[in-house]
């Protein structure tokens, strides 16, 4: 309304004993320039005198007189727009209402601003996003309803009492709309941050502690798992039993389902934290892991490589190459599935053991006709000796020998 002076400033300002208060303020008088300004503390209107009573913190008239004891209060304004004030230092008993008594040539106005001065530095306030999820960056905000040019402060972030390594952005506002100091820290929380305490610490310019606020991080994450196997080396013999246990070291929220995977494929009807494999066979060798899910998603354990050891299976012989031409070279390969791998081989030619041949491969550099026939082998490992397989036939081609005419 046009009959009022127009003021803009924060409604309430906050400070603490010994700090300072900076009051950003603008105004528009009804007519002409400001001629007199008095800053009252808790002003009360006296109907008898038609004047305001209260402690005068600052006075400025046409004569320019300022009470000498009020050097801590400064009017930083002007005669037509700016009514900014500074109180440095500010004291506990400055709390209450500040009254800005303004007078122009023909008009008067009393503008009230609330001042809240606490005994000790009040804590900042940490603001967290509604949900924090592992590996998704979040911004933590620390807000303090205080800023003053004459009293530098800093906000520091701590994780479990140790300064955080991530960089923060600190901003201050000293405007007619708001007065605050804010620190924003962006970081990528990991599951291990769940339950940890984050602190925003208010410090003076020298790093001295003034106050703080703390929050406990609630980091949503997939289940974190540990897999244990008995025996611990995951090496067993055919017919033995194996037990695998899945342990949830952390899950937020709680887990809902459990499953086991072998070589990436889900094992049917295995939905408990223990996987019992009785009388294992060699086909049960492979990579096992457990998978536990919660509302965030599935978590997988590390893989355990189960080795089921068995004696060599009946062996087969591969010949490179048959038929072979006399004088060429030939290689025989004994093939037998076994775990561990065979360490010894026995070779047979036409059912008769070949002396001195104990390797997986037999190499004949120069084939002769008498080398023709059936070759078989037997593989052996620490668990036993395999059976001799059917063998392979070597055919040797050669030119006619001892030609006789009939």
């Amino acid at each position: 309304d046009s009959s009022k002076w127009v003021f803009e400033h924060p409604e309430t300002l906050y400070a603490w004993e010994g700090a300072c208060v900076w009051i950003p303020c603008t105004y528009r008088a009804l007519d002409g320039d400001l001629e007199s300004f008095i800053l009252f503390h808790n002003p009360e209107y006296n109907k008898n005198t038609s004047k305001f009573d209260g402690t005068r913190l600052y006075e400025s008239t046409k004569d320019g007189k300022v009470p000498s004891e009020q050097k801590r209060v400064q009017f930083l304004g002007d005669k037509n727009k700016n009514c900014t004030l500074s109180i440095h230092p500010v004291h506990l008993n400055d709390s209450g209402q500040l009254g800005l008594r303004m007078e122009s040539k023909t008009e008067k106005w009393m503008e009230r601003i609330h001042l809240n001065v606490s005994e000790r530095p009040f804590p900042p306030h940490i603001q967290l996003p509604p949900e924090i999820q592992e590996s998704q960056e979040v911004t933590l905000t620390c807000l303090l309803n205080f800023s003053c040019y004459g009293y530098p402060i800093q906000l520091q972030w701590l994780l479990e009492g140790v300064p955080m390594r991530q960089a923060a952005v600190t901003s201050t506002s000293l405007t007619i709309k708001s007065v605050f100091t804010r620190s924003e820290l962006k970081f990528s929380p990991q599951w291990s941050h769940h339950g940890k305490i984050v602190t925003c610490q208010l410090q003076d310019a020298d790093g001295k502690f003034l106050s703080n606020d703390t929050v406990q991080l609630n980091v949503k994450h997939t289940p974190k798992l540990e897999i244990k196997v008995t025996p611990s080396d995951a090496i067993v013999r055919e017919g033995d039993s194996v037990t695998m246990t899945c342990e949830v070291s952390s899950s937020n929220p709680e887990y809902t389902t459990v499953s086991w995977l072998k070589d990436g494929t889900s094992l049917k009807k295995q939905n408990t934290f223990t996987l019992n494999l009785r009388e294992v066979t060699k086909d049960q060798s492979g990579k096992y892991c457990c998978q536990v899910s919660n509302d965030v998603g599935p978590g997988r354990s590390e893989e355990v490589f189960l080795q089921v050891q068995y004696a060599p299976e009946p062996s087969t012989v591969q010949i490179l190459h048959s038929p072979a031409v006399e004088g060429s070279q030939v290689e025989f390969l004994c093939m037998s599935l076994a775990n561990p791998l065979p360490t010894n081989y026995t070779w047979y030619h036409n059912g008769k053991e070949m002396q001195g041949r104990t390797e997986e491969k037999v190499h004949i550099p120069k084939i002769l006709p008498w080398h023709a026939g059936t070759y078989s082998c037997v593989a052996e490992n620490i668990l036993g000796t395999g059976q001799r397989g059917p063998g392979a036939e070597l055919d040797v081609q050669y030119p006619p020998k001892k030609v006789t005419t009939v």
Epitope: P163, M164, R165, Q166, A167, V169, T170, K186, S188
Partner: antibody, heavy 119, light 106 residues
Framework: QVQLKESGPGLVAPSQSLSITCTVS????????VHWVRQPPGKGLEWLGM???????DYNSALKSRLSISKDNSKSQVFLKMNSLQTDDTAMYYC?????????????WGQGTLVTVSA | QIVLTQSPAILSTSPGEKVTMTCSAS?????MYWYQQKPGSSPRLLIY???NLASGVPVRFSGSGSGTSYSLTISRMEAEDAATYYC?????????FGAGTKLELK
């Protein structure tokens, strides 16, 4: 192992824009931040900006109006785009990854790509 | 932004000597990071979190400091240590580097 490699145009005309690609291996761009740092010949290092695992960015305020950082997680590539280049933008441009997910010093650097701004 | 001032700008020393260079911050930082750079190469992280040695860095390098004052020390200078050393802060955006200390062999 962790590796980063920059590739750029080499020569850029004044007032034109610059595009550099950083191709990474040995880690996931969806989990780690990647930063851009430049170094004019014979001078010191200047941090340009960064891209977070989730894709949000932070820039050096002095260059913010000219910079854009983006990425393609599936191709393991991070892109730096800079507009209105002047001769004082001539520098070696590096991409770097911190020790941790988002902090801890630049433990991994690319070999750098030299960008010369000249007519 | 936080300004990091390194001193001295140039340092000449002989093999076997102890070398100390400093980095002063315009406002308090939580941790300091140190890099070594040789001509034609990318920077190499030497020290992280003020005093921790990065992987593969010889134990003759050490870092210390707090608040606004930090230092990098080489207990016994070796010929291969001749390089430019940069400090860097990770407390406030924008991340900033010092102008560098050039370490030369006498």
């Amino acid at each position: 192992q962790v590796q980063l490699k920059e590739s750029g145009p080499g020569l850029v005309a004044p007032s034109q824009s610059l595009s550099i690609t950083c191709t990474v291996s040995g880690f996931s761009l969806s989990r780690y931040t990647v930063h851009w740092v430049r170094q004019p010949p014979g001078k010191g290092l200047e941090w340009l900006g960064m891209i977070w695992g989730g894709g949000s960015t932070d820039y050096n305020s002095a260059l913010k109006s000219r910079l854009s950082i983006s990425k393609d997680n599936s191709k393991s590539q991070v892109f730096l785009k800079m507009n209105s280049l002047q001769t004082d933008d001539t520098a070696m441009y590096y991409c770097a990854r911190p020790h941790d997910f988002d902090a801890g010093g630049f433990a991994y650097w690319g070999q750098g790509t030299l960008v010369t701004v000249s007519a | 932004q936080i300004v990091l001032t390194q001193s001295p700008a140039i340092l000449s020393t002989s093999p076997g000597e102890k070398v100390t260079m400093t980095c002063s911050a315009s406002s308090r930082v939580n941790y300091m990071y140190w890099y070594q750079q040789k001509p034609g190469s990318s920077p190499r992280l030497l020290i992280y979190d003020t005093s921790n040695l990065a992987s593969g860095v010889p134990v003759r390098f050490s870092g210390s400091g707090s608040g606004t004052s930090y230092s990098l020390t080489i207990s016994r200078m070796e010929a291969e240590d001749a390089a430019t050393y940069y400090c860097q802060q990770w407390t406030s955006y924008p991340l900033t580097f010092g102008a560098g200390t050039k370490l030369e062999l006498k």
